[in-house]
Amino acid sequence: VPPGEDSKDVAAPHRQPLTSSERIDKQIRYILDGISALRKETCNKSNMCESSKEALAENNLNLPKMAEKDGCFQSGFNEETCLVKIITGLLEFEVYLEYLQNRFESSEEQARAVQMSTKVLIQFLQKKAKNLDAITTPDPTTNASLLTKLQAQNQWLQDMTTHLILRSFKEFLQSSLRALRQM
């Protein structure tokens, strides 16, 4: 603590520095809290959260999902394969998070925070990964045309797309969190 500390403004006591695993865990929970805040606005604004017509919109989307072969589930768990899947999936979600940026009126700042904190999470995970060569980065041209296509949808489909992105991202992060806690 620097000199000149006054008694009413005492710094927190020293604690053990955060480990990589702890910090990644906290970062995922940070993003999940952000998703909850965004979902609250989405569900209040429209009835998408109760809709049964999700399949109609889902056809337009290719949202990352965890599968058995990814090595992230308890059966057939493979640390390296799973970490590659988590990073690749997050990179694939980035275009969808970009789409979300203009979809919120009262939660504009939260949408930006979710996008930026995901970029930070990717950085943290890339430091942890040994096999960075196995991580495929999405093609920027493909992403740009996907973004244009999503933004050209009618209002109902855009609302549904927003809801599906948030739901899928939440599920992906929850699976990632469980898997990372085993590493």
Epitope: S20, A113, V120
Partner: nanobody, 131 residues
Framework: QVQLVESGGGLVQPGGSLGLSCAAS????????IGWFRQAPGKEREGVAC????????YYADSVKGRFTISRDNAKDTVYLQMNSLKPEDTAVYYC????????????????????????WGQGTQVTVLS
């Protein structure tokens, strides 16, 4: 040993610029919210700028807004404070500090200039703007 080290201080003419750096040893700086504080002789320490580790958002005290820029490079594990249009009243010892004030979504950004939010402190670097 866990420590923060500031560098880049010095003597400068009014209107000049200086760039401060903050690096860590013994822990990963990228995992923490970082604040820059300053203390002039006979004055209370004040928070001038901070940057989140969670979403990279920034906050500035009114006294430095538009003149100072805080940034971080997670690959280099370093945080910077670029100070432009310096005034004699910017003369002080500048400290960087690391804390976990930014780990809860919806944290109040302005809280980051409160010293009790920080766990680790550097020894400081002197910045003198000639009057």
């Amino acid at each position: 040993q866990v420590q923060l080290v500031e560098s880049g201080g010095g003597l400068v003419q009014p209107g000049g610029s200086l760039g401060l750096s903050c690096a860590a040893s013994g822990f990963t700086l990228a995992y923490y919210g970082i604040g820059w504080f300053r203390q002039a002789p006979g004055k209370e320490r004040e928070g001038v700028a901070c940057i989140s580790s969670s979403d990279l958002s920034t906050y500035y005290a009114d006294s430095v807004k538009g003149r100072f820029t805080i940034s971080r490079d997670n690959a280099k594990d370093t945080v910077y404070l670029q100070m432009n249009s310096l005034k004699p009243e910017d003369t002080a010892v500048y400290y960087c500090a690391a804390g976990t004030w930014d780990l809860k979504f919806g944290y109040s950004r302005s809280n980051c200039v409160r010293s009790y939010e920080y766990d680790y402190w550097g020894q400081g670097t002197q910045v003198t703007v000639l009057s």
